[in-house]
């Protein structure tokens, strides 16, 4: 799966993750930080 | 308009496996979680998980892992949900419900049945 | 988990009266963007819930002003100013703040 950085207007995006950019699928994807999960690490779980 | 559209009732024999449907129209189907509801005959709501269509991305309730196990096709813009080794508790109406990032519970199914008898 | 303990179970009352509902969490629900995701459904016999309130005191398009929500941190309050027949039911409060999400265990509506 080749990927890249996401553009600039994705920035606050990912609101707890990085986010980077499927290129064969051309969708944006978040990679959460540890403890969250969520399409957008918007979800903290305990 | 959004609307979330069932299967039909189910009976099925203790230890068996069934598997339920949820057909959603009126929105772009990755764009929304689909999320699972149990209610016992007169009890309350469980949320057993959510499923985001497209890249798929999964969380189950750990009360319901290894019991559940949700999946969609985006061809047909449908989730299904497994229920595996079914035991009487596993008896209830079992609810799909979308619900949009950091947004309600805006739109339901009507539910479907699962009756667990020998 | 976070744990909703709502209060009462049963509430019976007159049609015309004030109704309240009260749901506390045992934790914060509040999110890390500030909002804080408790949200209210309604479940009449043989329907689905339907959603009243959400993000404690937004009301859902169509949900008539006598329904309120009000509340922050872990205790939260459901009114009814005036009750109608058609309100009767069963109450849930949700949050979606963490996962696993969790619903309280409902308040049933009834006439006295």
């Known amino acids: 799966v080749s990927i890249t950085k996401c553009s600039s207007d994705m920035n606050g995006y990912c609101l707890h993750g990085q986010c980077i950019y499927l290129v064969d699928m051309s969708q944006n994807y978040c990679r959460c930080e540890v403890g969250y999960t969520g399409v957008r690490c918007e979800h903290f779980f305990l | 308009q959004v609307q979330l559209q069932q299967s039909g009732p189910e009976l099925v024999k203790p230890g068996a496996s069934v598997k339920i449907s949820c057909k959603a129209s009126?929105?772009?189907?990755?764009?929304?979680?689909i999320n699972w509801v149990k209610q016992r005959p007169g009890q309350g709501l469980e949320w057993i998980g959510w499923?985001?269509?497209?890249?798929?991305?999964?969380y189950y309730n750990p009360k319901f892992k290894g019991k559940a196990t949700l999946t969609v096709d985006k061809s047909s813009s449908t989730a299904y949900m497994l229920l595996s080794s079914l035991t009487s508790e596993d008896s209830a109406f079992y609810f799909c419900a979308r619900r949009e990032v950091l947004s309600p519970f805006a739109y339901w199914g009507q539910g479907t049945l699962v009756t667990v008898s020998a | 988990d976070v744990l909703m303990t709502q209060t009462p179970l049963s509430l019976p009352v007159s049609l015309g009266d004030q109704a309240s509902i009260s749901c506390r969490s045992s934790?914060?629900?509040?999110?890390?963007?500030?909002?804080?995701?408790l949200e209210w459904y309604l479940q009449k016999p043989g329907q689905s819930p339907k959603l009243l309130i959400y993000?404690?005191?937004n009301r859902f398009s169509g949900v008539p002003d006598r329904f309120s929500g009000s509340g922050s941190g872990t205790d939260f309050t459901l009114k009814i100013s005036r009750v109608e027949a058609e309100d009767l039911g069963v109450y849930y409060c949700?949050?979606?703040?963490?996962?696993?999400?969790?619903f309280g265990g409902g308040t049933k509506l009834e006439i006295k």
């Open positions: 009126g929105y772009t189907f990755t764009d929304a979680y």
């Open positions: 949700f949050h979606g703040t963490h996962v696993p999400y969790t």
């Open positions: 993000k404690v005191s």
């Open positions: 499923i985001w269509p497209g890249p798929v991305i999964t």
């Open positions: 934790q914060s629900i509040v999110h890390s963007t500030g909002n804080t995701y």
